[in-house]
Amino acid sequence: MRRERGRQGDSSSCERQVDRVNLKPCEQHIMQRIMGEQEQYDSYDIRSTRSSDQQQRCCDELNEMENTQRCMCEALQQIMENQCDRLQDRQMVQQFKRELMNLPQQCNFRAPQRCDLDVSGGRC
């Protein structure tokens, strides 16, 4: 369930663009970064996919947005919301946020100036 967020620029346009792209590779890439070879991600079905491929696919998907720079924050917020319930503790939430904010740099995009990743009523 998507909640309403304040965004820079045309929010409905960004929402449509974020809805169109597949954010799963980004979610999987970040979970793999954080958890690596640990058993917790067995059910996540990413052992079969090379970690570098997930990173590349993530960047490719984000690049599919017509205005990647302007809609980046919306995409990061959506990833956070999608994964919030999977994050087991406060430390993991912080690590996930740190990785999310680093995603534009990993993909060689400009980072959003401000992006509030507090979602799900403060749970994340």
Epitope: I34, G36, S51, S52, M101
Partner: antibody, heavy 122, light 107 residues
């Protein structure tokens, strides 16, 4: 300018455990996209990747060494460590610590320590 | 695991000559290949990443090319300080591997 410095004993007895520490200066160890790594070079031979560890504790090791390798990271101290158990003369090498950058557009060891020579001998 | 084979093992050339070093990946390494230079008694240093991009401080005489399975490092005109050992390294997936190295020596 970020620098890496290896430290540890230069001589280890066969069957014992080799322990090395790398200290990171002028950078935080918990920066995303950086894997803190160990590489070794036996005398007169090429480079061999030992393993890499992320600030979260996520680690990857060379399959040929994995059963003997333990890596850890101490974020507040800006240090990461390597332990290699049951050493033999074949583990005699110069051991380097290095930073591995893992971006989509840059995947490489961009910063290296000067290396520390470890000899396994009784 | 990707195996990297470098050739030749040794390259004997004179200053001013052109050097071409080869690195073959099996299976494919995509474009995720880096080249390092190691001078005697020193740690390796990054020269080229992403197969063809020069690292900071890498002189323009060094260039990288290739993708997939075949990669080359070219030194357009050898300077005295270029006589060293060169290693390729991949990262299309873990584990990371290095090639066996090519020594560029003075003829």
């Amino acid at each position: 300018q970020l620098q890496l410095q290896e430290s540890g004993p230069g001589l280890v007895k066969p069957s014992e455990t080799l322990s090395l520490t790398c200290t990171v200066s002028d950078a935080s160890i918990d920066t995303p996209s950086y894997f803190w790594s160990w590489i070794r070079q036996p005398p007169g031979k090429g480079l061999e990747w030992i393993g890499s560890i992320y600030y979260t504790g996520n680690k990857y090791s060379n399959p040929s060494l994995k059963s003997r390798v333990t890596m850890s990271v101490d974020t507040p101290k800006r240090q990461f460590s390597l332990r290699l158990s049951s050493v033999t003369a074949a583990d005699t090498a110069v051991y380097y610590c290095a930073r591995y950058v893992d971006y989509v557009w840059l995947r490489a060891f961009d910063i290296w320590g000067q290396g520390t020579r470890v000899t396994v001998s009784s | 695991e990707i195996v990297l084979t470098q050739s030749p093992a040794t390259l004997s050339l004179s200053p001013g000559e052109r050097a071409t070093l080869s690195c073959r990946a099996s299976p494919s390494a995509g474009r995720f290949l880096a080249w390092y230079q190691q001078r005697p008694g020193q740690a390796p240093r990054l020269l080229i990443y992403d197969a063809s991009k020069r690292a900071t401080d890498t002189p323009a005489r060094f260039s990288g090319s290739g993708s997939g399975t075949d990669f080359n490092l070219t030194i357009a005109s050898l300077e005295p300080e270029d006589f060293a050992v060169y290693y390729c390294q991949h990262r299309s997936n873990w584990p990371l591997t290095f090639g066996g190295g090519t020594k560029v020596e003075i003829k």
